[in-house]
């Protein structure tokens, strides 16, 4: 392990889609892949009128994107799903939305996950 | 173990379009992304975009966008690549990558474009 | 983002070893690790070798290796086989906000 990185072992698991994917809805799921390759958790979510609703949070394979992120942020600004991805144990049981302007200041929206 | 299996070859006339499908078995699906590349007979290996395979969002090389069209479906573990307004220029082998590394690719689908 | 530079082709004897040069600029192979080399064999879909510059895939060969110098990144072959005759391209890491290019690919002749 390289000093100073969060190694991702398991991350939160939620699918609102659980029945047609044929899994289950909760709970928390091991990482599995390649030896040398990093892992990462992941969320995704959809704002509904200002109602957060999550789509699927858990394990997401090696991505650049997700280096050295200890939070789950989704930068992108208004995507129709939103989605985030981190470094380290359960790290996706909380995301937030920081969306990147160009002018503007950045503004904060954290989320705290109801999964129904 | 990872497997990509794809699509049979397509026989296209120009001006139609045609839909690759590429789907995934060893591994959860909806973990990374899928990238599609091409290859034209003789030459190299042209990336034409790539899907998120969890939330479905898509980035195209400029080449092909207005051209193409890349969706999943989660519940079959299938990406698809739709390209239109086809040209014989467009005939080559059509691969799906996995993830950003393209650490595992199917085995390629043929698309040959001819009046 | 333009096209990684590769040449045409190289060849070496069984048992040299033979180093293959992707050239990029500064904003793509200079300044970050996202580089990987791919080996494809005539018919054959081609497969990743090394990812992240210097990375080797799992079950490559230890005969493979990656390295960078400023905004050329190399792939190297030693104990030259025949079985490594192919064609071997470099590629850049494709997903979220970045987006991916190939080199031109390099015919690797095992004399």
């Known amino acids: 392990a390289i000093l100073g990185r969060s190694e991702t072992q398991e991350c939160l698991f939620f699918n609102a889609n659980w029945e047609k994917d044929r899994t289950n809805q909760t709970g928390v799921e091991p990482c599995y892949g390649d030896k040398d390759k990093r892992r990462h958790c992941f969320a995704t979510w959809k704002n509904i009128s200002g109602s957060i609703e999550i789509v699927k949070q858990g394990c997401w394979l090696d991505d650049i994107n997700c280096y050295d992120r200890t939070d789950c942020v989704e930068k992108k600004d208004s995507p129709e799903v939103y989605f985030c991805c981190c470094e380290g144990n359960m790290c996706n049981e909380k995301f937030s939305y920081f969306p990147e302007m160009e002018v503007t200041q950045p503004t904060s929206n954290p989320v705290t996950p109801k999964p129904p | 173990q990872v497997q990509l299996v794809q699509s049979g070859a397509e026989v296209k006339k120009p001006g139609a379009s045609v839909k690759v499908s590429c789907k995934a078995s060893?591994?959860?699906?909806?973990?990374?992304?899928i990238n599609w590349v091409r290859q034209a007979p003789g030459q190299g290996l042209e990336w034409m975009g790539t899907?998120?395979?969890?939330?479905?969002?898509?980035s195209y090389a400029q080449k092909f966008q207005g051209r193409v069209t890349m969706t999943r479906d989660t519940s079959i573990s299938t990406a698809y690549m739709e390209l239109s307004r086809l040209r014989s220029d467009d005939t080559a082998v059509y691969y799906c990558?996995?993830?950003?590394?393209?650490?595992?690719w199917g085995q390629g689908t043929l698309v040959t474009v001819s009046s | 983002q333009s096209a990684l530079t590769q040449p045409a082709s190289v060849s070496g004897s069984p048992g040299q070893s033979i180093t293959i040069s992707c050239t990029g600029t500064?904003?793509?192979?200079?300044?970050?690790?996202?580089v990987n080399w791919y080996q494809q064999h005539p018919g054959k879909a081609p497969k990743l070798m090394i990812y992240?510059?210097?990375k080797r895939q799992s079950g490559v060969s230890n005969r493979f290796s990656g390295s960078k110098s400023g905004n050329t990144a190399s792939l190297t072959i030693s104990g030259l086989q025949a079985e490594d005759e192919a064609d071997y391209y470099c590629?850049?890491?494709?997903?979220?906000?970045?987006?991916?290019?190939f080199g031109g690919g390099t015919k690797l002749t095992v004399l």
């Open positions: 990558a996995r993830g950003g590394w393209f650490d595992y």
């Open positions: 060893g591994y959860t699906f909806t973990s990374s992304y």
């Open positions: 899907i998120n395979a969890v939330s479905g969002s898509t």
């Open positions: 500064s904003s793509d192979v200079g300044s970050k690790n996202y």
């Open positions: 992240g510059v210097s």
């Open positions: 590629g850049t890491f494709a997903g979220g906000d970045y987006y991916g290019v």
